[in-house]
C-alpha cells in the first residue's frame, strides 16, 4: 500500500513539475526590467527564451520573436536546449510511469517489469528536473553578470550632456517557476526510485535442497534473482516545443487602439 502511495505521489509531483517546466519554458518573463533605483519609465520591458516584450503605460503590449538562431547568445541557446531536453525526458518519463503504476493493470505485466519501468521513469524525472534547474540557473547567472556590468556603466553619454539610460534586467517570474518545477520533478523522480525498491519482487522461495558432501553438511539456497534494470524504450525523442516564436513581426495583445488593465 505504501509503495503504491509513494509511486502515485511521485507520479503526481512529477506531473506538476513537468507542467511547471513547460510553463516556465513558454513564459515571457524570464528577465524583467529592474525598476529599483532606475529613472521612472512609462514602458516595462521583459524577455523570455523565445521573444521579448514591451508593455506601455497605455496597456499596449508588443512582443517580438527572436527570429535568428545564429545571432542569439550561446548561453540562451544552451538554456533553450536544457529546457527542451528536460521537457522531452519528462514527457517520456510520464508516459513510462503511467504504464508502471501499480494501480494500473496491463495484461499480465510482471512486477519486475513495473519495477524496471518505475526506476526508468524515476531516473528520467531526476534528469529532467536537473536539466530545468540547470537551465534556469545558467540564465540567472547570465542575468546577474549582465546586471552588474550594466550597473557599472548605467549611464553612457557624450560628454555628460546627453544621457542614455541603460535598461537593467532582473529575475523574472519564469525563473522561480522553473526552479520550483525542476525541484518538484526531481523530488517526484526520487519518489519513483524509492517506490521501485518496494515494487521489486522479494527473494523467490525455493525449498532448501541439502547436498551431502563427504565430511561436511552444506545447505545451499539459491538467492532470489533481482530483475534487470535495463528497461528498453524505443520511444523517439520528439521535439515537443516548436520555439513559440510568432511568425508576425509584431504581436499586439488586443485588436483595439488601447487596452490596459
Amino acid at each position: 500500500m505504501a509503495v503504491t502511495a509513494c509511486q502515485g505521489l511521485g507520479f503526481v509531483v512529477s506531473l506538476i513539475g513537468i507542467a511547471g517546466i513547460i510553463a516556465a519554458t513558454c513564459m515571457d518573463q524570464w528577465s524583467t526590467q529592474d525598476l529599483y533605483n532606475n529613472p521612472v519609465t512609462a514602458v516595462f520591458n521583459y524577455q523570455g527564451l523565445w521573444r521579448s516584450c514591451v508593455r506601455e503605460s497605455s496597456g499596449f503590449t508588443e512582443c517580438r520573436g527572436y527570429f535568428t538562431l545564429l545571432g542569439l547568445p550561446a548561453m540562451l541557446q544552451a538554456v533553450r536546449a536544457l529546457m527542451i531536453v528536460g521537457i522531452v525526458l519528462g514527457a517520456i518519463g510520464l508516459l513510462v510511469s503511467i504504464f508502471a503504476l501499480k494501480c494500473i493493470r496491463i495484461g499480465s505485466m510482471e512486477d519486475s517489469a513495473k519495477a524496471n519501468m518505475t526506476l526508468t521513469s524515476g531516473i528520467m524525472f531526476i534528469v529532467s528536473g536537473l536539466c530545468a534547474i540547470a537551465g534556469v540557473s545558467v540564465f540567472a547567472n547570465m542575468l546577474v553578470t549582465n546586471f552588474w556590468m550594466s550597473t557599472a556603466n548605467m549611464y553612457t553619454g557624450m560628454g555628460g550632456m546627453v544621457q542614455t539610460v541603460q535598461t537593467r534586467y532582473t529575475f523574472g517570474a519564469a525563473l522561480f517557476v522553473g526552479w520550483v518545477a525542476g525541484g518538484l520533478t526531481l523530488i517526484g523522480g526520487v519518489m519513483m526510485c524509492i517506490a521501485c525498491r518496494g515494487l521489486a519482487p522479494e527473494e523467490t522461495n525455493y525449498k532448501a535442497v541439502s547436498y551431502h558432501a563427504s565430511g561436511h553438511s552444506v545447505a545451499y539456497k539459491p538467492g532470489g534473482f533481482k530483475a534487470s534494470t535495463g528497461f528498453g524504450s524505443n520511444t523517439k525523442n520528439k521535439k515537443i516545443y516548436d520555439g513559440g516564436a510568432r511568425t508576425e513581426d509584431e504581436v499586439q495583445s488586443y485588436p483595439s487602439k488601447h487596452d490596459y488593465v
Epitope: 526590467q33 521612472v40 512609462a42 514602458v43 521579448s52 503605460s57 497605455s58 487602439k257 488601447h258 488593465v261
Partner: antibody, heavy 118, light 113 residues
Framework: QIQLVQSGSELKKPGESVKVSCKAS????????MNWVRQAPGQGLEWMGW????????TYADGFTGRFVFSSDTSARTAYLQISSLKAEDTAVYFC???????????WGQGTLVTVSS | DIVMTQSPDSLAVSLGERATINCKSS????????????LTWYQQKPGQPPKLLIY???TRESGVPDRFSGSGSGTDFTLTISSLQAEDVAVYYC?????????FGQGTKLEIK
C-alpha cells in the same frame, strides 16, 4: 466613436476649490488611462499626470502634487480633476486626454477654462 | 525631468514649401526593448485641443495626411511637412512619452510667409 466631453468653464475666487469632469463615451472606460494637461493663457502645454482608470492609481508631475487630485467613477464613465486652494496662477484651460499607442495622448476633451480671480 | 527643446520658436513658410521643426530631448527616448523612440508630435490650432499627429517618432496617426512625417532617434527628432497647406497653420508640440513626467516642448508656431 471615442469622445471626451468636459464640464463647462468655471470662475472661482482664490482659496476655493474646483472639480473638472471628463465624461468618456465610445469605448470601455477602464481600458484607457486618463491624462490631464494644463495650458495657461498664451502658453504651452503642461502635462499634469494621469490616472489608471482600472486601478485608480495616479501619477503626478512634479508641480502638481498636493493641491491636485485625479479621480474616476467607473459607473459614470467619468474622470475628475479636483484643485483645492486655488491661486491666480491656476487660471488655465485644463484638458483631459486618453493614452494611446506609444503612450501618446490620442483623444482629447474640448478643454475647461478655470479662471481664478478675486 | 526630461527637457524637450524645440527649434525654431516660430517658422514662416510659403504655401507648397517644406516646413521642418526640430525637437531635442535631454535624454534618449529610445527603448532598447523594442527599438522604438517614445516621442510624439501634436498640432494645436487656436481655440482647439491638440491633435495627435505622430507617435513612436515616425508612426503617423490614422487620418493624418501623408505630408506629415516624423524622423529621428535617441535625442534628436524632426517633424516635416512636405508641402505646406493653409490648414497647417498651427502650433506644433513634441512630447516625451518615455520618462515620467511626460514633458512637452515649448511649441513651434508655424505661419504662412
Amino acid at each position: 466613436q471615442i469622445q471626451l466631453v468636459q464640464s463647462g468653464s468655471e470662475l472661482k475666487k482664490p482659496g476655493e476649490s474646483v472639480k473638472v469632469s471628463c465624461k468618456a463615451s465610445g469605448y470601455t472606460f477602464t481600458n484607457y488611462g486618463m491624462n490631464w494637461v494644463r495650458q495657461a493663457p498664451g502658453q504651452g502645454l503642461e502635462w499634469m499626470g494621469w490616472i489608471n482608470t482600472y486601478t485608480g492609481e495616479s501619477t503626478y508631475a512634479d508641480g502638481f502634487t498636493g493641491r491636485f487630485v485625479f479621480s474616476s467613477d467607473t459607473s459614470a464613465r467619468t474622470a475628475y480633476l479636483q484643485i483645492s486652494s486655488l491661486k491666480a496662477e491656476d487660471t488655465a484651460v485644463y484638458f483631459c486626454a486618453t493614452l494611446g499607442y506609444g503612450n501618446s495622448l490620442a483623444y482629447w476633451g474640448q478643454g475647461t477654462l478655470v479662471t481664478v480671480s478675486s | 525631468d526630461i527637457v524637450m527643446t524645440q527649434s525654431p520658436d516660430s517658422l514662416a513658410v510659403s504655401l507648397g514649401e517644406r516646413a521642418t521643426i526640430n525637437c531635442k530631448s535631454s535624454q534618449s527616448l529610445l527603448n532598447s526593448g523594442n527599438q522604438r523612440n517614445y516621442l510624439t508630435w501634436y498640432q494645436q490650432k487656436p481655440g482647439q485641443p491638440p491633435k495627435l499627429l505622430i507617435y513612436w517618432a515616425s508612426t503617423r496617426e490614422s487620418g493624418v495626411p501623408d505630408r506629415f512625417s516624423g524622423s529621428g532617434s535617441g535625442t534628436d527628432f524632426t517633424l516635416t511637412i512636405s508641402s505646406l497647406q493653409a490648414e497647417d497653420v498651427a502650433v506644433y508640440y513634441c512630447q516625451n512619452n518615455y520618462f515620467y513626467p511626460f514633458t512637452f516642448g515649448q511649441g513651434t508656431k508655424l505661419e504662412i510667409k
